[in-house]
């Protein structure tokens, strides 16, 4: 059974990750970005269900196409380099899921754009950490 | 608008320590990038550390190993320590605050605080 003490470090590791891509998103939709349009044109898939820990395994094999993409916006002025970020957020997502139990992750059929995709996963993290607060 | 409140610069022998902070107030996004960026005499400005909200972070190559970046979310405030100093250290150091992962008109800049490193 899952104690306060892991419940407490699940919470602070959903509030990482969600901040991320919270921050990634706020990146992407800056009104100044000039190469927004081109990262609209590249599709993610989307989780088919994604209400548990372990659907994570569905971002997860999105986040390589997440950093290319992250990659056009400025590459000679970066604070964080798409690698710094995809780098944590993949560690994050392992500790989150764990790395005992395969899921075969399911997609839905249809494709999003970027800005979907984070906003799919924002929510995602955002429900999780209302259930355990 | 946010304000940057810088503290920790000094003099400091090589192979010294320091330890840098700065708070943000203001108009904060809980999702952001905080971190410090120098400019030394007839030098442009550069990367020393920045790290996120969410606890990612990017070191220049010539500080790894020697800086460590940190924050603390609740109370918007990040920290540069500072070991093994070089007389190449020796510049201003700038608070930067972003809601972005990359450089837009919209981060906010510190005043500076100036680090001395000489025997």
């Known amino acids: 059974a899952p104690t306060s003490s892991s419940t407490k470090k699940t919470q602070l590791q959903l509030e990482h990750l969600l901040l991320d891509l919270q921050m990634i998103l706020n990146g992407i939709n800056n009104y100044k970005n000039p190469k927004l349009t081109r990262m609209l044109t590249f599709k993610f898939y989307m989780p088919k269900k994604a209400t548990e820990l372990k659907h994570l395994q569905c971002l997860e094999e999105e986040l390589k196409p997440l950093e290319e993409v992250l990659n056009l916006a400025q590459s000679k002025n970066f604070h964080l380099r798409p690698r710094d970020l995809i780098s944590n957020i993949n560690v994050i997502v392992l500790e989150l899921k764990g790395s005992e139990t395969t899921f075969m992750c399911e997609y839905a059929d249809e494709t999003a754009t970027i800005v979907e995709f984070l906003n799919r996963w924002i929510t995602f993290c955002q429900s999780i950490i209302s259930t355990l607060t | 608008e946010v304000q940057l409140l810088e503290s920790g610069g000094g003099l400091v022998q090589p192979g010294g320590s320091l330890r840098l902070s700065c708070a943000a107030s203001?108009?904060?996004?809980?999702?952001?990038?905080m971190g410090w960026y120098r400019q030394a005499p007839g030098k442009q400005r550069e990367l020393v550390a920045v790290?996120?909200?969410?606890?990612?972070?990017n070191y220049a190559d010539s500080v790894k190993g020697r800086f460590t970046i940190s924050r603390d979310n609740s109370k918007n405030t990040v920290y540069l320590q500072m070991n093994s100093l070089r007389a190449e250290d020796t510049a201003v150091y700038y608070c930067?605050?972003?809601?972005?992962?990359?450089?837009?008109?919209?981060?906010?800049w510190g005043q500076g605080t100036l680090v001395t490193v000489s025997s």
């Open positions: 930067m605050y972003s809601g972005s992962y990359y450089y837009t008109p919209n981060d906010y």
């Open positions: 203001g108009s904060i996004f809980s999702a952001n990038a």
């Open positions: 790290i996120s909200s969410g606890g990612s972070t």
